[in-house]
C-alpha cells in the first residue's frame, strides 16, 4: 500500500472540510473484518441494531456493508479558509436507512436510522493503510478512529503518527 498517512494534528476539526458532491462518487458492497480476521456483524435486537466483533463459524455468511465514497476538500492547517487538497470520505450502511455513527461523547460507534442528508457523525475519512488495510477517521473528531475494544467497535483516540498502525484501528474490506 501507499504507506500510512499520519494522525491529523490540526486543531480545527475535519468537519471544516466540505463534501464536494451530495451524491457519492461510487459505492462498494463489502464485508468488514478486523486486522486479525474477526468479522464485524450486525444484529437486530429490541428494534435496534447491535454491532459485534466476532469469529464466524466455518461457512457462516459474512455481513455486508455498503460503503459510499465522497470526495472532500481537505482544510489547510494555515488558515481556516484554505484548502490543502482532496481526501476520500465514506459512510457505512449495513442495512437500508441505517448508518454507522460516531458518538464522540460516549466514544462509541452506533447504528442510527436517519434520512439524507446524513449528519457529519456518519462520515469517516478513509485512510489507505499498509498490509491491505484501511482505517476510518471521524469527520467530526480528527485523530479519533473506529477501532476494536472488548469485542465491540469503539472510538479510539490516536495521539501520534507512530500509533496509527495500531492493529485495533486497522480493518480489511473484501467482496467475499
Amino acid at each position: 500500500a501507499f504507506g500510512i498517512s499520519g494522525v491529523q494534528k490540526y486543531t480545527r476539526a475535519l468537519h471544516d472540510s466540505s463534501i464536494t458532491g451530495i451524491s457519492p462518487i461510487t459505492e462498494y458492497l463489502a464485508s468488514l473484518s478486523t486486522y486479525n480476521d474477526q468479522s464485524i456483524t450486525f444484529a437486530l435486537e429490541d428494534e435496534s441494531y447491535e454491532i459485534y466483533v466476532e469469529d464466524l463459524k466455518k461457512d457462516e455468511k459474512k455481513d455486508k456493508v455498503l460503503l459510499s465514497y465522497y470526495e472532500s476538500q481537505h482544510p489547510s492547517n494555515e488558515s481556516g479558509d484554505g484548502v490543502d487538497g482532496k481526501m476520500l470520505m465514506v459512510t457505512l450502511s449495513p442495512t437500508k436507512d441505517f448508518w454507522l455513527h460516531a458518538n464522540n461523547k460516549e466514544h462509541s460507534v452506533e447504528l442510527h436510522k436517519c434520512e439524507k442528508p446524513l449528519p457529519d457523525q456518519a462520515f469517516f475519512v478513509l485512510h489507505n493503510m499498509h498490509s491491505n488495510c484501511v482505517s476510518f477517521e471521524c469527520k467530526t473528531d480528527p485523530g479519533v478512529f473506529i477501532g476494536v475494544k472488548d469485542n465491540h467497535l469503539a472510538l479510539i483516540k490516536v495521539d501520534s503518527s507512530e500509533n496509527l498502525c495500531t492493529e485495533n484501528i486497522l480493518f480489511k474490506l473484501s467482496e467475499t
Epitope: 504507506g3 498517512s5 494522525v7 462518487i25 462498494y28 487538497g85 489507505n128 503518527s161 496509527l164 474490506l173
Partner: antibody, heavy 119, light 111 residues
C-alpha cells in the same frame, strides 16, 4: 501555501553516494506519507520510495532496494533519500512528493533536484 | 508489476476541440471499489501536477474541461475544449499497489 523544496542533487561517479533532502512547509508534515519519484532524461516517471507518516513503513522499487534509504525528520519537516552504489541508470530528476490526506495518490510535487551519474 | 500502456504517444488537437488520451493497465487497478488510476499534467521545466484521481475526480483547482473516465483496466482522459495552456505531457499512474507505476506519457500539442 503547501511547498516542497528538494536539494542535494549533483554529479557523481558510478559507485558514489548522494543524500537528497526535501524541506516541507505549509502543512502538518508528520501527518502525511511522503515519496520520491524520479524522471529519467527520456522523461519516463518512476516511483522510487515511500515512507509513511509515523515512519512505520517504507517501500522501495526493486531497482534501488539495498542501495537507497528513505527517511524523515518530522521535527525538521524534512524528507531524505540516501543514495549509495549509484549507477548510470539512476541519472534523473528526483522529485519529492506528498500523498493526499488519507494516502491515495501523489498530490503535491516539489520542483525537483538533478542527479547525474557518469564516469 | 502493473504495466500502464498509454496511447497515443503524440497528439495534435485544434483549439476548442476534444483531446482524448487512453491508458490501459495490464491488470485491474480496482481496490475497495475504487479505480486507483490517476492523471498528471507536466509542462516543460515543471514538476507533474495532479489532474485526476481515482479515475474521474478532479484535483484541487483543476478546470472542469479536464475529465477522466473508465474502470478496471481501461481509462481515458478528456480535455474539452482544448486551450493553448493545455500543451503539455500527460501521464497516467496507478496507486493500487507497490511498485506504483506510470504510463510512458502522451505529448499533447495545439494544431
Amino acid at each position: 501555501d503547501v511547498n516542497l523544496v528538494e536539494s542535494g542533487g549533483g554529479s557523481v561517479k558510478p559507485g558514489g553516494s548522494l543524500k537528497l533532502s526535501c524541506v516541507a512547509s505549509g502543512f502538518t508534515f508528520s501527518s502525511f506519507s511522503m515519496s520520491w519519484v524520479r524522471q529519467t532524461p527520456e522523461k519516463r516517471l518512476e516511483w522510487v520510495a515511500t515512507i509513511s507518516g509515523g515512519k512505520t513503513f517504507t517501500d522501495y522499487v526493486d531497482s534501488v532496494k539495498g542501495r537507497f534509504t528513505i527517511s524523515r525528520d518530522d521535527a525538521k519537516n524534512t524528507l531524505y533519500l540516501q543514495m549509495s552504489s549509484l549507477e548510470s541508470e539512476d541519472t534523473a530528476m528526483y522529485y519529492c512528493t506528498r500523498a493526499n490526506y488519507g494516502n491515495w495518490f501523489f498530490e503535491v510535487w516539489g520542483a525537483g533536484t538533478t542527479v547525474a551519474v557518469s564516469s | 508489476d502493473i504495466v500502464l500502456t498509454q496511447s497515443p504517444g503524440f497528439l495534435v488537437v485544434s483549439l476548442g476541440q476534444r483531446a482524448t488520451i487512453s491508458c490501459r493497465a495490464s491488470e485491474s487497478v480496482a481496490k475497495y471499489g475504487l479505480s486507483l488510476l490517476n492523471w498528471f499534467q507536466q509542462k516543460p521545466g515543471q514538476p507533474p501536477k495532479l489532474l485526476i484521481f481515482a479515475a474521474s475526480n478532479r484535483g484541487s483547482g483543476v478546470p472542469a474541461r479536464f475529465s477522466g473516465s473508465g474502470s478496471g483496466t481501461d481509462f481515458s482522459l478528456n480535455i474539452h475544449p482544448m486551450e493553448e495552456d493545455d500543451t503539455a505531457m500527460y501521464f497516467c499512474q496507478q496507486s493500487k499497489e507497490v511498485p506504483f507505476t506510470f504510463g510512458s506519457g502522451t505529448k499533447l500539442e495545439i494544431k
